[in-house]
């Protein structure tokens, strides 16, 4: 009985559609599949950024696959054909691997690329990215930012740059419709008459870099002779209440009494009748229910209560 063999897929390639890191891996069926017309052929695809320890592995019946990559590094991929055991009256048969690579030919030395790239999605509404020019680049160097996320037809260039000494050092983005909970790709490239400039690629998800506004309307309410309830309201804007964590800092008579993290808009504080002054500030951050990470807001304005009459029901300033 002859050994069953199958060829690897043909024309395996990585295609860059210009989406700044979102690439297409595509291939054609292997030659000589005539013997297996009744069979559903599958493909095992492995791919990774060069330098990564682990391969991502996909088994698919399709002739294409799409995923995001870090274009600062090269990409390697390999694929082989799988004949399920049902097709071969025995064990699964695999072809040899077809392999391909892709990288963007780097221009310029690494030091010329932007430094300290920092992006913040303010209040889940306004994205702002800033950077420092590369090391040793001249003032004639200018950087340009391009971005793409699924839903855009093509990569877009920043139209509102932040400038210093005539150089672009940041970008204020326009309203980004349906842009969260998906990968957001950025490329910052540059040009200079003096020397070539290295491009930089970045990928993140917007909900993970949100910096909310601080909480507002801080108030005190006397609950009992030894308890005061601190209350505040969620920051103004589109972020739902369930998405916030809060950190409170409370000072009693100029001594830091409590720093606490809470998940709702109240905190009950034990006090004594000797308390002369009570001040607190609060800040907010998007929590784990709504994102994988977040950035603390600025602290709220300080709210203080001063005086001897602790019997007042509500203490507002």
């Amino acid at each position: 009985d002859t050994e069953i063999k199958v060829n690897p897929p043909q024309d395996f390639e990585i295609v860059d559609p210009g989406y700044l890191g979102y690439l297409y891996l595509q291939w054609q069926p292997p030659l000589s599949l005539d013997h297996f017309k009744e069979c559903t052929v599958e493909y095992e695809l492995k791919y990774r950024n060069i330098g990564s320890e682990t391969w991502k592995t996909i088994i698919t019946k399709n002739l294409h696959y799409k995923d995001g990559f870090d274009l600062n590094k090269g990409i390697e991929a390999k694929i082989h054909t799988l004949l399920p055991w049902q097709c071969t009256n025995g064990s699964e048969v695999q072809s040899s691997w077809a392999e391909t690579t892709y990288w963007i030919s780097p221009q310029g030395i690494p030091e010329t690329k932007v430094q300290d790239m920092d992006c913040v999605y303010y209040n889940w509404q306004y994205l702002l990215c800033s950077w420092k020019p590369g090391i040793g680049v001249l003032l004639d160097t200018n950087y340009n930012l391009f971005y793409w996320y699924e839903g855009l037809d093509h990569a877009l260039q920043c139209v509102d740059y932040i400038k210093a000494d005539g150089q672009n050092i940041g970008c204020r983005f326009p309203y980004l419709e349906a842009s969260d909970y998906k990968d957001f790709y950025i490329c910052v490239n540059g040009s200079s008459e003096n020397k070539p400039i290295r491009s930089s690629y970045f990928t993140f998800q917007l909900q993970n870099i949100v910096k909310p506004l601080p909480p507002v309307y801080l108030t005190f309410t006397r609950e009992s002779s030894c308890e005061i309830k601190l209350k505040w309201s969620i920051p103004l804007g589109p972020i739902p209440a369930r998405c916030f964590d809060y950190e409170i800092e409370i000072r009693e008579d100029d001594t830091t009494l409590v720093t606490a993290t809470v998940e709702n808009e109240t905190y009950t504080l034990k006090t004594t009748n000797e308390t002369r002054q009570l001040c607190f500030v609060v800040r907010s951050k998007v929590n784990i229910y709504c994102s994988d990470d977040g950035i603390w807001s600025e602290w709220s304005d300080k709210q203080c209560w001063e005086g001897e009459d602790l019997s007042k029901k509500t203490l507002l300033r």
Epitope: K56, R242, I288, Y289, C290, D292, D293, G294
Partner: antibody
């Protein structure tokens, strides 16, 4: 592919301590919040603790607050659970799980195979 | 804390049957509800998130519905590999699971 591999389980006496580890691979570990979920023998699932991608925010079930500490080392792609003052009711298989997020919500999209912690004298 | 109650606790059915499992929350959780399948000795597997969204790679015979406090998981035509324990889980506040529904072969 995404892989989560727990280790560190075993037999410990009541009042003792144990440190669980979860080695992650196949994804950008620092970009994801992570969690520990446990399952007592023959029982249902119970969420234990969670940590944000950077490690800056941590969350605990009331049943373990003050006794367990969750942490992560993003340079080692590893999640930890330090368990102190262990009780018989902490006996369970402990799973490491990765968070996925959708519009203002979350779920556990990948789970490890679990590690068994037995608290008994 | 939010309690999640599943019914029934166990259920016997045959291959090809249509099966419905219900989950009730002790307070409104909007659509912040997920469903998992667990087989003996294995880790849970996500089936449905946000009450009705099918997780990638999960067969379309699984569907979810509901919002507020009452939710259902439906398997339109049971397959042999579907016999397992199913859990609902809310992520509205903290992360609590239902007690599980064991689906057995009749």
């Amino acid at each position: 592919e995404v892989q989560l591999l727990e280790s560190g389980g075993g037999l410990v006496q009541p009042g003792g301590s144990l440190r669980l580890s979860c080695a992650a691979s196949g994804f950008t570990f620092s970009s994801y919040a992570m969690s520990w979920v446990r399952q007592a023998p023959g029982k249902g699932l119970e969420w234990v603790s969670a940590i944000s991608g950077s490690g800056g925010s941590t969350y605990y079930a009331d049943s373990v607050k003050g006794r367990f500490t969750i942490s992560r080392d993003n340079s080692k792609n590893t999640l930890y659970l330090q368990m102190n003052s262990l009780r018989a009711e902490d006996t369970a298989v402990y799973y490491c799980a990765r968070y996925g997020h959708y519009a203002y919500g979350s779920y556990f999209d990948y789970w490890g195979q679990g590690t068994l912690v037995t608290v008994s004298s | 804390d939010i309690q999640m109650t599943q019914s029934p606790s166990s259920l016997s059915a045959s291959v090809g049957d249509r099966v419905t499992i219900t989950c009730r929350a002790s307070q409104s959780i909007s659509s912040y509800l997920n469903w998992y399948q667990q087989k003996p000795g294995k880790a849970p597997k996500l089936l449905i998130y946000a009450a009705s969204s099918l997780q990638s790679g999960v067969p379309s015979r699984f569907s979810g519905s509901g919002s507020g406090t009452d939710f259902t998981l439906t398997i339109s035509s049971l397959q042999p590999e579907d016999f397992a324990t199913y859990y609902c889980q809310q992520d509205y506040y903290l992360f609590t699971f239902g007690q599980g529904t064991k689906l057995e072969i009749k």
